[in-house]
């Protein structure tokens, strides 16, 4: 699997989307889980509804929630209130019995947050509210892992 | 010109907590920027602790994020450092900085050294 | 994470000087901008705002320091090195919301 990077503003909210076929994995629940350490196990985060009829109902563990289009084949997850220490490597999964496949790798990236202080220049996203209280606007850049990009950098 | 001034005790002993005070004077904080506290461990090396924004807003770095707490008095125009449980790798020259995004941390103070030791 | 090279860098006054720094991450930020500047510490103060956003002097910074690169790759010259301009030199990133600084490079007299 590629590893898909999105990108998010620290106190913003993120939206990760993972495409899959919607008949392979059909009747299957999905997950969403931290890679603990480059080879490491994948701690679950979140799961969607444990009745598959009922996975486009939002289901929230903390900050972060998931739902699942089954028609669409389209599982999201949004990471709300982003802060440095959601910065990492995830996986989209999808659950039959005990076993677990991968839809996606994700590297989440956090951002500075262009918000966090008014003399900001360009730092303005165009188009964005000037304000906390009206700021909702969910900001997702995915792009593929670049060449010489370490998704795990060693901890000094 | 802002200027800014660490001060706070200079020795702590192990598992106790460390507190320093930043005051800033020539800016008030809750005009703008983020308000940072840095430390520079024996042989150099730099690390960005965690700031307090104009508005009271809080990021912390997830290495410290457990022990950790940036608090301030905007009447006495301070920001504070509170770091429990402190240990000997917690020696080190700490510094208050203002960022500016554009600028990076334009503004430093001179840094005070807290040494940890029983 | 970033890694500074060299380490130590003897020099002799009036040669150019060149430090490089390397980011495990891009530091594009989405709104296009990269925020990658450079500091210089002199033994006894704080470190002091050189460079910011990779190739912009900050006020007061003489001509003959110079930042360069993009994405992951970063460099900074100084022309002519002077005896004032010895020190240790960092870069930092603020464009991830975890802001980190390189390991430094020390400028000294060969």
């Known amino acids: 699997h590629n590893t898909t990077v999105f990108q998010g503003v620290a106190g913003q909210s993120l939206q990760v989307s993972c495409p899959y076929d919607s008949m392979k994995h059909w009747g299957r629940r999905k997950a969403w889980c931290r890679q603990l350490g480059e080879k490491g196990p994948c701690q679950r985060v979140v799961s969607t509804h444990n009745l598959w009829l009922l996975s486009f109902l939002r289901r929230w563990n903390g900050s972060t929630a998931i739902t699942d289009d089954t028609l669409g084949g389209t599982l999201t997850i949004t990471l709300r209130n982003l802060q440095p220490h959601d910065a990492g490597l995830y996986q989209c999964q999808s659950l039959h019995g005990s076993e677990a496949d991968t839809l996606r790798k994700v590297l989440v990236e956090v951002l500075a947050d262009p918000l966090d202080h008014r003399d900001a220049g360009d730092l303005w996203f165009p188009g964005e509210s000037e304000s906390f209280e009206d700021a909702h606007v969910e900001h997702s850049i995915s792009r593929s892992l670049l060449e010489g990009e370490i998704p795990f950098p060693p901890t000094s | 010109d802002v200027q800014l001034q660490e001060s706070g005790p200079g020795l702590v002993k192990p598992s106790q907590s460390l507190s320093l005070t930043c005051t800033v004077t020539g800016y008030s904080i809750t005009s703008d920027y983020a308000w940072n506290w840095i430390r520079q461990f024996p042989g150099n090396k730099l690390e960005w602790m965690g700031y307090i924004n104009y508005s009271g807003r809080t990021i912390y770095n997830p290495s410290l994020k457990s022990r950790i707490s940036i608090t301030r008095d905007t009447s006495k125009n301070h920001f504070f450092l509170q770091l429990i449980s402190v240990t000997t790798e917690d020696t080190a020259t700490y510094y208050c900085?203002?960022?500016?995004?554009?600028?990076?941390?334009?503004?430093w103070g001179q840094g005070t050294l807290v040494t940890v030791s029983a | 994470w970033m890694t500074q090279n060299p380490l130590s860098l003897p020099v002799s006054l009036g040669d150019q000087a060149s430090i490089s720094c390397r980011s495990s991450q891009s530091l594009v930020h989405i709104n296009g901008n990269t925020y990658l500047h450079w500091y210089l510490q002199k033994p006894g103060q704080s470190p002091k705002l050189l460079i910011y956003?990779?190739?912009n002097r900050f006020s007061g910074v003489p001509d003959r320091f110079s930042g360069s690169g993009s994405g992951t790759d970063f460099t900074l010259k100084i022309s002519r090195v002077e005896a004032e301009d010895l020190g240790v030199y960092f870069c930092?990133?603020?464009?991830?919301?975890?802001?980190?600084f390189g390991s430094g490079t020390k400028l000294e007299i060969k």
């Open positions: 956003k990779v190739s």
């Open positions: 930092s990133q603020t464009t991830h919301a975890l802001f980190t």
């Open positions: 900085a203002r960022w500016n995004g554009n600028y990076g941390f334009a503004y």
